[in-house]
Amino acid sequence: KIDACKRGDVTVKPSHVILLGSTVNITCSLKPRQGCFHYSRRNKLILYKFDRRINFHHGHSLNSQVTGLPLGTTLFVCKLACINSDEIQICGAEIFVGVAPEQPQNLSCIQKGEQGTVACTWERGRDTHLYTEYTLQLSGPKNLTWQKQCKDIYCDYLDFGINLTPESPESNFTAKVTAVNSLGSSSSLPSTFTFLDIVRPLPPWDIRIKFQKASVSRCTLYWRDEGLVLLNRLRYRPSNSRLWNMVNVTKAKGRHDLLDLKPFTEYEFQISSKLHLYKGSWSDWSESLRAQTPEEEPTGMLDVWYMKRHIDYSRQQISLFWKNLSVSEARGKILHYQVTLQELTGGKAMTQNITGHTSWTTVIPRTGNWAVAVSAANSKGSSLPTRINIMNLCEAGLLAPRQVSANSEGMDNILVTWQPPRKDPSAVQEYVVEWRELHPGGDTQVPLNWLRSRPYNVSALISENIKSYICYEIRVYALSGDQGGCSSILGNSKHKAPLSGPHINAITEEKGSILISWNSIPVQEQMGCLLHYRIYWKERDSNSQPQLCEIPYRVSQNSHPINSLQPRVTYVLWMTALTAAGESSHGNEREFCLQGKAN
């Protein structure tokens, strides 16, 4: 704390608040009888700038010229030093350095709406660090003037509170802003404008949309605007899109027909307004209107596939599968699928509506020629039916694709490749690649996936519904007219050694050999496609290496004979399973002693 100048005075010229770059004169003078005891020439006056000595003088007063002070506050303290005593504070001074206002730039004025008030903004320029008074002046026709002041360090906006009217839209108005602080003043360049230049219309309101006869092709957008609006621009987009469609309209009078909307799509609409073709500015965009366009009947055709399963000598099961139409093809909410099954020679037909599923299973006689047609229906109509003749898809051996392989291709993808069939490859009209999770029971409830490939392709990347560590049964069909040939293979996108080995559930003796039966490894423990089983055996209590028999994996197989065991010797047996990544741990161990004679 600095004492309140009891021993002397500090005077400052020209002021305690100075312009950046200017000089300040600081004088420190002792009051009478306030110097050092005995001799005044022993008085040593010292001037400090913060804690640093910058000047001293022997006598009753000290005069110092200071330059180069930074923006903001600098503290000076005058002290008296006498021989054999501590320095005594005399008085202090704070000098504040600021900046004269720069010329305000980019003065622009706006009136929001025909009933709004004129408000102006500008760029202040460099911070003055000082209280700066801004005066905004507006002069108009008939020597009318308005003035508004704002007394704030950071002022860059003022509202006159007056409303310009359209009586004489071409009349000129001039605005100017002047900044004044204790270090100087500066005025902007004048900004001259007319009513039409500065009135920015209010955004349109009360936006509505109407579809005549519930049709997307007869759509009108309605809105309300201020009275003088001449131009509008409309923008609209599907709610899930980032790109806007833009339309400019003149003298729209609050309505416009839109011709290119897609059916059954939620759109966002916004409108902006302007008073004059080339003067003034566009209003803000209106609040968004969100509306869904009406449905139209579906376009496109369903992608249909099927599976045949033999039941007995007279009956077969047909399972039909189809893919959903894309949103742009469905053009509405699909209410049901219509499936028609027809025997082509007898003409008998049955039709069924399916809701909530994209598959249908039925049982038909094995005799006769059968065809199906499947279409999708929404509230406005149905898609064109997809017709398929039911045939034996794998009957034509010469049409079977050759050298089918399935290889992992990155995460959760399988690349299926093949060679064209031996029979004239040009006869192939298309390939269908089908895949489903491999289930030992051949479960028909397992979802079926397929994709179609052009006749010149010899590979397909399958990625839909592919999971890691699951084995898929993959078939490639070559279709030609009413014939088909197929080849199959197992494949997985990612594999590792199975988590467990098969569980031996029985060992039986048959004519000097044994039959081992086992339970399949649970699908979730197989960890990919099984390639082999191994059966191990060795004499009980023996340290010798076990013998083994390797069996290629077949889906339906769960027993195998072994005929190399010695009679009346107790053996320990166990099994493992192998994928391309390695061998599982042991399954359970079983002991067995063959009773019969050795072979």
Partner: nanobody, 119 residues
């Protein structure tokens, strides 16, 4: 912001004395500088004298030796002792307070008090 109230103005004979007083109220903390300005009819407003919170002073050349500015920091009062008054000292006298506002100065002004020196 600070509110300033001036008092002490009036009519005085040339050569006479007056004391103007200015009291600061409101958020009067951290008042860096208290000043007296004057504005004669048809002229620019000019600095008369100022006093910092540490007691240092500045005087206009025209009043040096005749006027004395003093400040009571505790009460936020600034006085201007005016001696040997001249007719050219006739003006409206305004009190001003500069307060710290972040790293800037914010100014507040009083409404003014009239001093008239007759010859």
């Amino acid at each position: 912001q600070v509110q300033l109230q001036e008092s002490g103005g009036g009519l005085v004979q040339a050569g006479g004395s007056l004391v103007l007083s200015c009291a600061a109220s409101g958020s009067a903390a951290l008042i860096f500088l208290m000043s007296w300005y004057r504005q004669a009819p048809g002229k620019q407003r000019e600095l008369v004298a100022e006093v910092s919170r540490y007691g240092s002073t500045t005087y206009a050349d025209s009043v040096e030796g005749r006027f004395t500015i003093s400040r009571d920091n505790a009460k936020n009062i600034v006085d201007l002792q005016m001696n040997s008054l001249k007719p050219e000292d006739t003006a409206a006298y305004y009190c001003k307070a500069d307060q710290y506002y972040g790293d800037s100065l914010r100014s507040s002004w009083g409404r003014g008090t009239q001093v008239t020196v007759s010859s």
